[in-house]
């Protein structure tokens, strides 16, 4: 069909903010559970600790986590799991000061990746019981279909 | 021509990851050599330590470098060289801890810029022999044509 | 109208760089005044310390500030004010070293948000007389209409 001016710009987008963060007892990771703050289009679905890709394609992904932790380095790993394998897409790493009053850093990263239908995207902090600030303007995750 | 739904969204994209990083003896810089990890469209060409712009226009550029270096500040400069002159587009700067075990930081920055046909884009770390982590999910460079 | 190949990709964009930064005597904030470095489209208008949204829609916003300050944590808040209320969209936070020679960090963040006609977007550093580096490639603000 012929595209109208309005249709032209309708990139699917999803901007997510945290519900909570938990650590499994047997795992040295902290996972974030997400909820949509902004959605346009139907190709992405928040699903517990992950986001399911329903519409394959090239996406701009971005992730920020706000850390309040004196562990010497903190950061997050954004991964996709699908077709029986897991792949790290990008990471953010931040050295943290040892004094609790100063140990406050956001870590932002982003990139463009091809995602497949059925992929599950997740943000993992490779630390058990990581001290995160779950403010929606400090910790968030987003997708733009290009 | 009338655009189909598929054509509509085909932004040219290029996401690059490192091959290696080297320093010239006569200059206090470290340069990264790039290879494509994801390419869509033909307007961008990885070329050694730079990326050649074949299709002029407005681009979202992003750059991340993962540093493992105790030099007190580290960072990268993204520049374009063309039409006989060099221009810094953006830079990322990160203070580093003095203890080697803690000296681990990614530095991400991005922006929207008009690039000209024939421009060469490069990422330079203004430190000779900078200690970088060249993992493809820690150090990368990307372009999206808008 | 039918979109040509050229029209197809014309996202409105605005990339701004600092004119100056000031603190009001009665306020614990530093504000940045912006000027356009790159503009495409008419939906965004730099206006003193803010950017006025003339064309409602979903935007990718990005912000970087380069700090040269020993205050223990520094960062910026990107907010929108409109329809009688103010809303924080996102924040960037960076712990700073206590030694002036090392206190040098850029702080970048970005996200996708729905902006309304008449909204005023601003970047605020919640510190009076914050020491910023106003280099156009160190401190900047940008918008891409999606």
């Amino acid at each position: 069909a012929v595209l109208t001016q309005k249709q032209k710009k309708q990139h699917s987008v999803l901007h997510l903010v945290p519900i909570n963060a938990t650590s499994k007892d047997d795992s040295d990771v902290t996972e974030v559970m997400w909820q949509p703050a902004l959605r346009r289009g139907r190709g992405l679905q928040a699903q517990g600790y992950g986001v399911r890709i329903q519409d394959a394609g090239v996406y701009l992904l971005y992730s920020q986590v706000l850390f309040q932790d004196v562990t010497f380095t903190m950061g997050q790993v954004v991964s996709r799991e699908g077709q029986g394998r897991q792949e790290t897409l990008f990471r953010c790493i931040r050295s943290m000061p040892s004094h609790p009053d100063r140990a406050y850093n956001s870590c932002y990263s982003a990139g463009v990746f091809h995602l497949h239908q059925g992929d599950i995207l997740s943000v993992i902090i490779p630390r058990a019981r990581a001290k995160l600030n779950l403010s929606p303007h400090g910790t968030f995750l987003g997708f733009v279909k290009l | 021509a009338v655009l189909t739904q598929k054509q509509k969204k085909q932004h040219s994209v290029l996401h690059l990851v490192p091959i290696n990083a080297t320093s010239k003896d006569d200059s206090d810089v470290t340069e990264v050599m790039w290879q494509p990890a994801l390419r869509r469209g033909r307007g961008l060409q990885a070329q050694g330590y730079g990326v050649r712009i074949q299709d002029a226009g407005v681009y979202l550029l992003y750059s991340q470098v993962l540093f493992q270096d105790v030099t007190f500040t580290m960072g990268q400069v993204v520049s374009r060289e063309g039409q006989g002159r060099q221009e810094t587009l953006f830079r990322c700067i990160r203070s580093m801890p003095s203890h080697p075990d803690r000296a681990y930081n990614s530095c991400y920055s991005a922006g929207v810029f008009h690039l000209h046909q024939g421009d060469i884009l490069s990422v330079i770390i203004p430190r000779a022999r900078a200690k970088l982590n060249l993992s493809p999910h820690g150090t990368f460079l990307g372009f999206v044509k808008l | 109208a039918v979109l040509t190949q050229k029209q197809k990709k014309q996202h409105s964009v605005l990339h701004l760089v600092p004119i100056n930064a000031t603190s009001k005597d009665d306020s614990d904030v530093t504000e940045v005044m912006w000027q356009p470095a790159l503009r495409r489209g008419r939906g965004l208008q730099a206006q003193g310390y803010g950017v006025r949204i003339q064309d409602a829609g979903v935007y990718l916003l990005y912000s970087q500030v380069l700090f040269q300050d020993v205050t223990f944590t520094m960062g910026q808040v990107v907010s929108r004010e409109g329809q009688g209320r103010q809303e924080t969209l996102f924040r960037c936070i960076r712990s700073m070293p206590s030694h002036p020679d090392r206190a040098y960090n850029s702080c970048y963040s970005a996200g996708v948000f729905h902006l309304h006609q008449g909204d005023i977007l601003s970047v605020i550093i919640p510190r009076a007389r914050a020491k910023l580096n106003l280099s156009p490639h160190g401190t900047f603000l940008g918008f891409v209409k999606l």
Epitope: - | D26, S27, T71, T88, P126, R127, A128, R129 | L132, N133
Partner: antibody, heavy 121, light 107 residues
Framework: QVQLVQSGAEVKKPGASVKVSCKAS????????MHWVRQAPGQGLEWMGY????????KYNEKFKGRVTMTSDTSASTAYMELSSLRSDDTAVYYC??????????????WGQGTTVTVSS | DIVMTQSPSTLSASVGDRVTITCKAS??????VAWYQQKPGKAPKLLIS???NRDSGVPSRFSGSGSGTEFTLTISSLQPDDFATYFC?????????FGQGTKLEIK
């Protein structure tokens, strides 16, 4: 306190080379770069480049590339600037000046007393 | 290279006067500008960095302002020790460049 002490005046013939030294004290030598700036008689200041003692790597002004060599000796906390193929218009006072280790975005906060180099046949 | 254009080249003033020296950069240099004072036969001395930050030990009568392409050095009340040559410098982009200098002399 921070001090930069430079070597004495030099008189050279055209085509010769000159090597000027700058001994630093009162701070950690490898945490700062050493800039070199020259000033021709009655003229302004001209930045020649810097040496980073942390990695002994230089950054040169393109105008001087091929003729200038900047080095450092961390054990002696001393920076050196050698200029070759001297011409009469290289007659100037040569200064070393300290800058922070991330050279861009930092001013030169301490200067040596200057070394006069005269090029004459 | 970025050109730093200083004005005036020479300035005649009296003790107690308020004087202003301006410096224009040929392109945006943010606030990465320094001002130096130089007396005959001496090395330059840093007065102001980051366009407006006084270096330690510099008297409060010296102030700097500006960002982008236009910068000023102001001496609020001239003292006998202030008669010298003043240089601006940009350190935003290599090569670092200086203004041609302003000679401040006694009227």
């Amino acid at each position: 306190q921070v001090q930069l002490v430079q070597s004495g005046a030099e008189v050279k013939k055209p085509g010769a080379s000159v090597k000027v030294s700058c001994k630093a004290s009162g701070y950690t030598f490898t945490s700062y770069v050493m800039h070199w700036v020259r000033q021709a008689p009655g003229q302004g200041l001209e930045w020649m480049g810097y040496i980073n003692p942390y990695n002994d790597a230089p950054k040169y002004n393109e105008k001087f590339k091929g003729r200038v060599t900047m080095t450092s000796d961390t054990s002696a906390s001393t920076a050196y600037m050698e200029l070759s193929s001297l011409r009469s218009d290289d007659t100037a006072v040569y200064y070393c000046a300290r800058g922070l280790g991330y050279a861009l975005y930092y001013a030169m906060d301490y200067w040596g007393q200057g070394t006069t180099v005269t090029v004459s046949s | 290279d970025i050109v730093m254009t200083q004005s005036p080249s020479t300035l005649s003033a009296s003790v107690g006067d308020r004087v202003t020296i301006t410096c224009k950069a040929s392109q945006n240099v943010g606030n990465n500008v320094a001002w130096y004072q130089q007396k005959p036969g001496k090395a330059p001395k840093l007065l102001i960095s980051s366009a407006s930050n006084r270096d330690s030990g510099v008297p409060s009568r010296f102030s700097g302002s500006g960002s982008g392409t236009e910068f000023t050095l102001t001496i609020s009340s001239l003292q006998p020790d202030d008669f010298a040559t003043y240089f601006c410098q940009q350190y935003n982009i290599y090569p670092f460049t200086f203004g041609q200098g302003t000679k401040l002399e006694i009227k």
